[in-house]
């Protein structure tokens, strides 16, 4: 029961998650004018991945997309690929831990093979949660430095325009959104992980007992367990307590041909 | 076409009250941010105040602030600004303007007259 | 707050020749965001509201005659009337629309010579 809790936990945990990365990566306000010098501005500054924002006092808003991509700095497109590599991780996690879940039935699955479906949706959702925290991370690292070089140009005049006052760009909502949301990603993925534990070891240890029973005579095969996996057997000639190594066997995380009967 | 029709003015001593309306018609009044401008007997403009489309934020010179308070009726499509504690220099044609794209007041009211005098 | 200078106070040009009035502010208008200048010019006739002429220093507004062209960037502006009308009689006024408190330049009263 505590096993089904914190699988659909994680789920809950990693759904949402997920959906605040997506969220926080089609947000315009990654970046926001700083209005520490200006609080009563008729004219707002905000940034985007996608798009760069400006709202008047008037009521109107007029967003421009980066319609280039040659010319967009180096970061910026760093930023990008770590936000869709951690949404496209944790949809792909997402649609494997619903077929996880311990409380869906589908056909004859076997619970050690939901064990590593669970296994291997927890560890996508950890790397997608920790995608979105670096990108946010890297995107906060690139504000602070451009924060500081343009106040060093306000009071030094590196800026080279007389009577200009540079705009400076402080944290934007989407940043504070992407940092709770990969936490939340990474939590749950924690939760799989931890949920994987618990969904493994009846049918392990039955089936680590039952071999032993039929002695060491029996020939290696591969697939010979039929453990009904598509993501690796966490079973194969495995005592379940040898600490979690792993054998030459074991590295495959993609099914075989072997795997299907 | 876009209508604003000021009311309200009229004589009033120093250091008293007055409340100035602006009916609007002919736009989505909720939508735009709005503002009052004032034009004293044969002199330049001079902006008075400023209130955002969703009433949450407003906006005042040094002149006037403390003792001018900008408001909107959405529902009523109507501007007001109360006017306290006014002296002889508030004396001026008051417009309320319809703020456009790029903070420009696009749309104007034909003004009503104050007259602070004792 | 921004202070917006014109000049001059008063301009008489014949019927049909050019009119330049020019306008100063004492900070940037131009917007980094999106590279326009919040600067906007108004025309006031005799006992009349003011109208809107041009916005974001050179965007004229919509049924403004193109003899009206507005240029300039920063902190530097100017409205030119191309071929000045007898209809062209009036007051002129920038305005500072970037921050609060929306600033007035004085005015440039424009007559026919």
């Known amino acids: 029961m505590a096993v089904t809790a914190c699988q659909g936990l994680g789920f809950v945990v990693s759904l949402i998650g997920i959906a605040g990365i997506i969220a926080a990566t089609c947000m315009d306000q990654w970046s926001t004018q700083d209005l520490y010098n200006n609080p009563v501005t008729a004219v707002f500054n905000y940034q985007g991945l996608w798009r760069s924002c400006v709202r008047e006092s008037s009521g109107f808003t007029e967003c421009r997309g980066y319609f280039t991509l040659l010319g967009l700095p180096a970061m910026l497109q760093a930023v990008r690929a770590l936000m869709i590599v951690g949404i496209v991780l944790g949809a792909i996690g997402l649609l494997v831990s619903i077929f996880a879940l311990k409380c869906i039935r589908i056909g004859s699955m076997e619970d050690s093979a939901k064990a590593n479906m669970t296994l291997t949706s927890g560890i996508m959702f950890i790397v997608s949660g920790l995608c979105a925290i670096a990108g946010v991370s890297v995107f906060a690292n690139m504000l602070v430095t451009n924060f500081w070089m343009s106040t060093a140009n306000m009071y030094t005049g590196m800026g080279g325009m007389v009577q200009t006052v540079q705009t400076r760009y402080t944290f934007g909502a989407a940043l504070f959104v992407g940092w709770v949301a990969g936490g939340l990603t990474l939590i749950g993925g924690v939760m799989m992980c931890i949920a994987c534990r618990g969904l493994a070891p009846e049918e392990t240890n039955y089936k680590a007992v039952s071999y032993h029973a039929s002695g060491h005579s029996v020939a290696y095969k591969p697939g010979g367990f039929k453990a009904s996996t598509g993501f690796g057997s966490n079973t194969k000639n495995k005592k379940i307590y040898d600490g979690g190594a792993r054998t030459e066997d074991e590295v495959q995380s993609y099914p075989s041909k072997h795997d299907y009967v | 076409e876009v209508q604003l029709l000021e009311s309200g003015g009229g004589l009033v001593q120093p250091g008293g009250s007055l409340r100035l309306s602006c009916a609007a018609s002919?736009?989505?009044?909720?939508?735009?941010?709005m503002s009052w401008v004032r034009q004293a007997p044969g002199k330049g403009l001079e902006w008075v105040s400023t209130?955002?489309?969703?009433?949450?934020?407003?906006y005042y010179p040094d002149s006037v602030k403390g003792r001018f308070t900008i408001s909107r009726d959405n529902s009523k499509n109507t501007l007001y600004l109360q006017m306290n504690s006014l002296r002889a220099e508030d004396t001026a044609v008051y417009y309320c303007?319809?703020?456009?794209?790029?903070?420009?007041?696009?749309?104007w009211g034909q003004g009503t007259l104050v007259t602070v005098s004792s | 707050d921004i202070v917006m200078t014109q000049s001059p106070d008063s301009l008489a040009v014949s019927l049909g020749e050019r009119a330049t009035i020019s306008c100063k502010s004492s900070?940037?208008?131009?917007?980094?965001?999106?590279?326009?200048?919040?600067l906007t010019w108004y025309q006031q006739k005799p006992g009349q509201p003011p109208k809107l002429l041009i916005y974001?220093?050179?965007t004229r507004e919509s049924g403004v005659p193109d003899r009206f062209t507005g240029s300039g960037s920063g902190t530097d502006f100017t409205l030119t009337i191309s071929s000045l009308q007898a209809e062209d009689v009036a007051v002129y006024y920038c305005?500072?629309?970037?921050?609060?408190?929306?600033?007035f330049g004085g005015g440039t009263k424009l007559e026919i010579k």
């Open positions: 303007a319809k703020l456009g794209r790029g903070n420009a007041m696009e749309y």
């Open positions: 002919e736009f989505t009044f909720s939508n735009y941010a």
């Open positions: 209130i955002s489309s969703g009433r949450s934020s407003t």
């Open positions: 900070q940037s208008l131009l917007n980094s965001g999106n590279q326009k200048n919040y």
């Open positions: 974001w220093a050179s």
């Open positions: 305005q500072n629309a970037y921050s609060y408190p929306f600033t």
